[in-house]
Amino acid sequence: AVNGTSQFTCFYNSRANISCVWSQDGALQDTSCQVHAWPDRRRWNQTCELLPVSQASWACNLILGAPDSQKLTTVDIVTLRVLCREGVRWRVMAIQDFKPFENLRLMAPISLQVVHVETHRCNISWEISQASHYFERHLEFEARTLSPGHTWEEAPLLTLKQKQEWICLETLTPDTQYEFQVRVKPLQGEFTTWSPWSQPLAFRTKPAALGKDT
């Protein structure tokens, strides 16, 4: 069995992907390992090959079907196993029962676009990607805006406590370059976490009109 220095963590994107990371101190980098998924009430099973992402951690994506297909539900339990090759046979390294809708991490929002920009304001919209229809409107978002001379880590977080796929940024500086990011999280799930941040959207506010107080 794997000792306390090992970790096996997986998340479900709510549609057809389970992403897993397995880490073990002292494991050989060239060891061939895989993750095997067996749902308790489905006819299919799936395997992915763990590929190194750092000195002692490996990752892989279990592709369960077409990206927008609903492959698992709230009642499913998936048994996940880490198997590593030892000579001619596979050795089980870890076994985890995984409730997909308790371990959600959605894909990053996509299709960010500027709907309207002014001197001090900018209206931005986006779309969620590969998100289950089960959520209905039970999603929340966080957004952040990168101002000149600052880092993303310094950017204050704006929280949208509902499924609102747009935002109106206020009190911006005229004729200034900004970047904007957003992430999404379902409200349900014991270990549900934020999606990755979206790709940044760059935009520039309009210059102030000369001789006018805007």
């Epitope: 306390g4 096996f8 270990f191």
Partner: nanobody, 127 residues
Framework: QVQLVESGGGLVQAGGSLRLSCAAS????????MGWFRQAPGKEREFVAA????????MYAVSTEGRFTCSRDNAKNTVYLLMNSLKPEDTAVYYC????????????????????WGQGTQVTVSS
């Protein structure tokens, strides 16, 4: 803090099944991660399974080979261990345990991680 009482042990033939129950009282059950351990005569206490506070993740000892299923019902303050395809080597006293600290369900916990223990229930598998 909770008190734990196991039940469901007994004598079973190889290949048979048993379902152990662990009833908790005197505390907020949903604030504890729960685990099952076993101890065979003359051997050290061995990890069997552990489940998180909400049951979203459950880790199993590799030795269970997928034959055991651990589940919890927070409404009933009970954690279960369903044991199928039992083997003589599964013979042991089975203990239920509760962990007050946070457990992510992503690693194998040690017996020292658990603070509260039941008195155990004997499981004997005959060949």
């Amino acid at each position: 803090q909770v008190q734990l009482v196991e039940s469901g042990g007994g004598l079973v033939q190889a290949g048979g099944s048993l379902r152990l129950s662990c009833a908790a009282s005197g505390g907020t059950f949903s604030s504890y991660a729960m685990g099952w351990f076993r101890q065979a005569p003359g051997k050290e206490r061995e990890f069997v399974a552990a489940t998180t506070r909400g049951g979203g993740r459950t880790m199993y000892a590799v030795s269970t080979e997928g034959r055991f299923t651990c589940s919890r019902d927070n409404a009933k303050n009970t954690v279960y261990l369903l044991m199928n395809s039992l083997k003589p080597e599964d013979t042991a006293v089975y203990y239920c345990a509760a962990m007050t600290s946070y457990y992510s369900g992503t690693y194998y916990p040690d017996s020292s991680d658990f603070d509260i223990w039941g008195q155990g229930t004997q499981v004997t598998v005959s060949s």
